[in-house]
Structures are given as C-alpha cells and as structure tokens.
C-alpha cells in the first residue's frame, strides 16, 4: 500500500509519501524517539518508517456489528441484524511508558485496542463492561484524548477522553478519565478513575438537554496537557442561539474546557467560549490547535518566559456549518498564561458569590454562585460547589493571519533558532509556512513566506506533526501521508532570492554559493561566511 515518492512541484525534489488507496486515513502520531510514524485509518493501523515506507499493517475491521447492539455481538447475542461494519480509528495515542499504541475505533460501541509498538501485535482490549465503551460515533475528527503517565515507579496512567455521543447519553459520557493498567487484560482497564454513589470521573450530557436540543453534542477538536491541567478545544451546539425547533438553523460555539489532572471527581471542570476577531469579522469555529513554546523573539514580544506554553489555533469564520465551515479562516495565538488568568478571575468571582454557574447545557438550571472564604490561586482544583463553571465572556486570541480563499484546516508550530515558525494545512492540500513576529514592519504579526502542495485538492487533516529532529513535517489527507521538508532553501539560487524569501531557516552560504541552513554551511560562524540578512548580500 506504500505509494511511490511524488514530485512536490516547482524545483523541489519529490516529497516522500505513503498512500492508502483503499482505506481513509484518520490519525497520525510520530514516535518522539524512533521517529517512526503510526497512522490510524478506517479498518487499519499502519506503522511506517520516518521516510514513510510501510513496516507493518494491523487489521481492525470491517467487523460484523450493529450499533444498536449493546453490548456488541461479539459478547452477547443481539436481536438486530448484523452487517459488515467499518471500524473508523478515532483516537491514536502513544503510551511510551508501556511501549504500546492506544487505538480507539468506532466499532463495538467504540472500544480501544492496545498494540505493541514494535510489530502492532494486539496486546489486548478491555473486558466488555458498560464503561469500557467510548462511543460508536463514526466521525473521525471528533474525539480527543490525553494520556497521563503515572508517577515513575508507582501510580497509574490514565486517559482523559472526550467524544461526541450522538444522543446516547445513557451509554456514553462526553468526557471521562479512565484507568490505564499495565496489564492489558486487567478487568479494571478503562474503568473510571473514580466512582462512588455521588460522583465519578465523567460528565454526561443530561437527557433534558437532549430532549430540548436533540442535535446537541460536543465535538472534541484538540486536547493537551499544560502544567497540572488538561485542556480540550471543543465545538458544541450553541443552545443560546439555536432554536429547539429541529428544522431551525444550527449555530455552534467553540469552547475551551479545563480539568485538573489530579481531580478524579471533575470538580475542576470549567469551560469558556473561545475565538478571535479581525477587522470586525468573528472567527468562532475551531478547526485545529497546536500547543507550542514561543521561541525567544515571540516570548520577548509577549512578555513570556521561553518555557511558557502558547496555543496556535485555526478558526473558521462565523458560527454555522460545523461540517463544512466557511473558507474564510484565521490563525490565532493564545497564551496559556492569559487563558489561566481569565479562568482564575471567573472562579474567584464565583467564589465571591457573584453571578451564576452559567453552564446551561450541563446544569439544566441556573445555579447561583456561593460566596466562600476559600483561597483561589493558580492551582485551584475546585470544590463540590460552584462547579461545573461556565465562562460568560469569550476568551479572545490574537489574530495572526487570515486566509479568505483556501481555508485553514490544520496547524503545527516550532521554534527555530529563537524564531517561531507555524505550518498551516489548507483545504486545497497545501502547507502554508508562516513566520510569526509581532514586531514585523507594517504591523503584520505574521508573514506567510512559502506555500507548498502536499496533495493537490485534498484537505489537510488535523494531525500535522513534526519529525523529532524538526527536519520534516508529516501532513495527512484522507488518502495520503506526505513528508514535507520544513525548509527548501536549496531552491533559491541567489543570495537575494535566498534572503528575500524570508524563510527563517535559510541563509546564503558563501563558501558553496548556495542557500542553506546555517548548520549545513561550513564555517558559518566565521565573518562573512553566512549571510542571514538581505543587506549582507550587497556586501558580499
């Protein structure tokens, strides 16, 4: 199934690719030590080398199934007719500590498998207990998870996972934290981290909400850990704007959800509307996000330390059409410091007894905040009251770049020698390379300096991932993975073209008269051996 290397256009050498003609690709992860690439697909999990040759394929479907069978037919006979059913990979996570891959599918009510990293041998799947089923929803880009390793030598790993539930709130929580046991056959595998008569490590969409808004669901776009918190970027039906009338127009809102890593009772649950605005246009439909560090220059411009987290996000314009959002989209920047501060202010306000909990989809009643002497600091993880808590004001990001024509679909970023480079995938299969610099002349906070084709005409999917050495970017469409070099300096044939490109990777290597990275240029640190500024071209 491996495809032939294919030309990337222009004078660039062909990019390495992997093609899956039969099965749609859904997720991609890269092992941070080995550089090997794991790809989730419909009915398959693939293991590829760093240069995208196929090493292993593991078959996950089709299976004889019916989503009305609960538990699945493999466990208990079912009165509904069975049919050959695709198993869509919806979550793919590397469990480094246990040397295994977690692959969650849509079949059998949404169970997960563990595969050995070396050879994709199936290590086990959970015992069929009610809480082991995550969700039978087939939409691939709607589930997100964060794997939290247990403390070294002791403690248990856990999985925070969010998923749409397609109205089946009695079966599936929308958000939960699950135990990950060392032994894949352990009966407690995927059990809730905590469960008692009153509370457990899960949130369910109340049946009242689904009665009033049958289409209500929460779609999880991106998740990450930052410090002691787990965050999710979600899209959910906006119950304030959407009429309960099923025939009416649906409006969506993007929310950032936060939980404390060590909060098994989910008392720390907070969600805030999130988005950004440019020139009076609101961008409210989150498409993708990427957690990164800012790079020396950007950190200085933002007043951050270099080791603080920032979040690059892509939003489509407006609040309609979740599945086919408008092409107009924006790349935006958030600092985790600002997000945390906004959330803390809201919690503090509520603990002063001000306002309401403001979470209509979850509470189904307007609960007032209760005044309390508890001290609310940056690390506060909630109590049994004043929770769950909703933000009433949208957390606004800084717009960096607006694409009115192509539509941004995916984002990744990294720090190259102190400068922040963002890669944005588009609807037409291109990768835009963007230099973020808030001190740019003319007030443009970002410069799109290059655009390359990964796969013409096919939208770039969300999992845009850098290789461990930051030399390549893996871009995935439904049918192909493409390895795109982060730079193509060699295409620029003169000093002026090289430095005029504004590619932060590129400089003019005087000794060989080629455009290259600094680390590829001999004696680059000697005077007048490596030009990194357009003015130096004239001097040379």
């Amino acid at each position: 199934e491996a495809g032939l290397p294919r030309a990337g256009g222009g004078s660039q050498p062909p990019f390495r690719t992997f093609s899956a003609s039969d099965w749609g690709l859904t997720h991609l992860v890269v092992h941070e030590q080995t550089g090997e690439v794991y790809v989730g697909a419909v009915n398959r999990i693939y293991k590829l080398s760093g240069n995208l040759t196929l090493l292993r394929a593991h078959v996950t479907g089709p299976v004889e199934d019916n989503e009305k069978c609960y538990p699945p037919p493999s466990v208990q006979s079912c009165p509904h007719g069975l049919g050959s059913t695709d198993n869509v990979n919806k979550l793919l996570l590397l469990d480094y500590a246990a040397n295994r891959l977690l692959a969650c599918g849509s079949a059998s009510q949404g169970i997960c498998q563990f595969l050995r990293l070396d050879d994709l041998f199936k290590l086990g799947e959970p015992h069929h207990r009610k809480e082991h089923y995550l969700s039978s929803v087939q939409e691939a880009g709607s589930m997100a998870g964060v794997l939290i390793a247990g403390p070294p030598g002791q403690g248990q790993a856990k999985l925070f996972v969010g998923t749409p539930i397609d109205g089946k709130s009695e079966y599936f929580p929308t958000l939960s934290s699950r135990r990950l046991m060392a032994n894949e056959e352990d009966a407690d595998m995927f059990g809730f981290v905590y469960q008692d008569e009153f509370v457990s490590s899960q949130l369910k969409i109340p049946s009242d909400t689904l009665s009033k808004f049958p289409a209500f669901d929460i779609y999880y776009v991106y998740s990450f850990r930052s410090e002691q918190f787990v965050y999710y970027l979600t899209l959910q039906l906006d119950t304030q704007l959407t009429s309960p009338d099923a025939a009416g127009e649906h409006f969506f809102t993007s929310k950032i959800v936060r939980l404390c890593v060590d909060d098994p009772k989910f008392y720390s649950y907070v969600e805030f509307p999130i988005g950004c605005e440019q020139a009076g246009v609101e961008y409210r439909l989150v498409q993708d996000a990427y957690l990164s560090r800012p790079g020396r220059a950007l950190a200085h411009q933002l007043g951050l330390a270099e080791d603080e987290d920032v979040l690059f996000t892509v939003f489509a314009q407006g609040q309609k059409n979740r599945v086919k959002p408008p092409k107009e989209s924006a790349l935006c920047l958030f600092t985790l410091r600002a997000i945390k501060e906004k959330i803390k202010e809201r919690i503090q306000s509520c603990y002063r007894g001000e306002g309401k909990l403001s979470l209509p989809w979850l509470l189904n009643k307007e609960l007032g905040c209760i005044n309390s002497p508890l001290q609310i600091d940056d690390d506060f993880c909630g109590q049994d009251f004043n929770q769950p808590l909703g933000g009433t004001v949208t957390i606004e990001g800084t717009p960096l770049f607006v694409d009115k024509d192509d539509g941004l679909t995916a984002v990744a970023a990294y720090d190259y020698r102190g400068r922040t480079v963002v890669f944005a995938g588009t609807r037409s299969g291109r990768i835009r390379k963007i230099l973020v610099d808030l001190s740019n002349p003319g007030g443009r906070p970002a410069l799109a300096y290059e655009s390359v084709v990964a796969q013409e005409g096919s939208p770039i999917l969300r999992d845009l991932v850098l290789s461990p050495n930051h030399q390549y970017l893996y871009a995935m469409t439904e049918k192909q993975v493409t390895r795109v070099p982060v730079e193509s300096c060699v295409q620029y044939t003169s000093c002026e073209l090289c430095l005029g490109s504004r590619d932060p990777h590129c400089g003019w290597c005087v000794l060989h008269s080629i455009c290259s990275r600094r680390d590829a240029c001999e004696r680059a640190d000697e005077p007048q051996r490596f030009a990194a500024d357009l003015l130096q071209c004239v001097q040379l």
Partner: antibody, heavy 122, light 107 residues
Framework: QVQLQQSGPGLVKPSQTLSLTCAIS??????????WNWIRQSPSRGLEWLGR?????????DYAVSVKSRITINPDTSKNQFSLQLNSVTPEDTAVYYC????????????WGQGTLVTVSS | SYELTQPPSVAVSPGQTASITCSGH??????ASWYQQKPGQSPVLVIY???KRPSGIPERFSGSNSGNTATLTISGTQAMDEADYYC??????????FGTGTKVTVL
C-alpha cells in the same frame, strides 16, 4: 459506615459556655471532601444550622449570623473529632443539638449524631 | 436573611400521593435537600440535589425544584412515612437554611 457520637453536658447555667463534642468514625475530620456541622432544634425555632468546620489545604469555618459573635467550632485531628462552644448562653439556647456531616452544599447532611438535649437553666 | 417556608401539615390517605412544598426567593437557583424526622430520632436525608435519592431511600420519594418552589413527593404513601419533613438549602453567602417543617399525617 460513618458514625457520629456526641458527648457533653445536658444542663448549662445561663451566661456560661455550652460545650459539646462529636467523635467521628468511618471518616476523617481532615477530609478534603467533607465538612462538619452543628445544628440545633427547638420547638420555637425548628431546625437551625449553627456552623461548620472543614479542611481545604487549611482550616475554614462558616457560622450562622445569629450566633456568629459567640460560637466557636474547632477540629481535633488527634482525636478525630470536632467541638462546639457557644458562649453567654440564655434559656433561648435550650435545644437538641446535633452534629452532622455534609459532603458539599448540594449533597445535604448525610450523617447525623444521635442528638443531645441541652437545657439552659439556673 | 434567607427564608424557606413550608405548609405546617399535610394529610394523605395510604397509597395516595403526598406533595410537600418549600418556597424561597429564587430557590430554583439553589440545590434543595429534604429530611425526614420521626419522633425522638435524628433527621434522615431523603433527597439531595433537588431530585436524587441516597442509597436505601425508597423510590416513592422524589423531588423537584424550579422557580421559587421545591417539592417533595411521596407516591404510594405508607403508614411508616408519617413524620416531619424539612427542606434545606444554602444561600449565596454559604449559610445553611432549613424550612419551617411539615408534619405529614397518614390517615
């Protein structure tokens, strides 16, 4: 199973201090998910919440406005108990006094002590 | 200060439904709990978070809360349900308030 066992005198003279203790078994007074309350009941006032103590990284107290100036609720971690002190009592403070546990504002008082009738009389 | 008002008494025939109301300003914006107390005994929690029953409480006890009124409903009332019933909520300044109490008599 959580149990709360109350102890203390049944008769207190006016202007003196009412002191009661509630011993906890099956839970910890330092639990970060419980609070420990004193509630009283009299024919004239019905059930009346007096206050509570709870630990959330440090100790906190909430008191009813009606008794705020003369009440103290203290935890005793070494004995896993908590106590009520009500100063300057009058016959109006005659009531059955209960200790009770709550697990948060929305969970109600799920365990109660057996109650102690305290009479304030000279 | 915040107040919760209940009817002093409710009479019900065995097997019938008894409804006890509890009124307070915007009570629906708070969580209500309900307690049963029999003579000479400590109160027992029968409903918390408006509608939820602790383990061991029969299904015939149910609760609701909206607007300014919380309601405890005992369906298929039995003789053993004869008792005093109290509603309870916390006000926004973290002070606990009990209702005035309702005596339920099973005829």
């Amino acid at each position: 199973q959580v149990q709360l066992q109350q102890s203390g005198p049944g008769l207190v003279k006016p202007s003196q201090t009412l002191s009661l203790t509630c011993a906890i078994s099956g839970d910890s007074v330092s639990s970060n998910s419980a609070a420990w309350n004193w509630i009283r009941q009299s024919p004239s006032r019905g059930l009346e919440w007096l206050g509570r103590t709870y630990y959330r990284s440090k100790w906190y107290n909430d008191y009813a406005v009606s008794v705020k100036s003369r009440i103290t609720i203290n935890p005793d971690t070494s004995k896993n108990q908590f106590s009520l002190q009500l100063n300057s009592v009058t016959p109006e403070d005659t009531a059955v006094y209960y200790c009770a546990r709550d697990r948060g504002y929305s969970y109600g008082f799920d365990y109660w002590g057996q109650g102690t009738l305290v009479t304030v009389s000279s | 200060s915040y107040e919760l008002t209940q009817p002093p008494s409710v009479a019900v025939s065995p097997g019938q439904t008894a409804s006890i109301t509890c009124s307070g300003h915007k009570l629906g914006e708070k969580y209500a709990s309900w307690y049963q107390q029999k003579p000479g005994q400590s109160p027992v929690l029968v409903i918390y978070q408006d509608t939820k029953r602790p383990s061991g409480i029969p299904e015939r006890f149910s609760g609701s809360n909206s607007g300014n009124t919380a309601t405890l409903t005992i369906s298929g009332t039995q003789a053993m349900d004869e008792a005093d019933y109290y509603c309870q909520a916390w006000d926004s300044s973290s002070v606990c308030v009990f209702g005035t109490g309702t005596k339920v008599t099973v005829l």
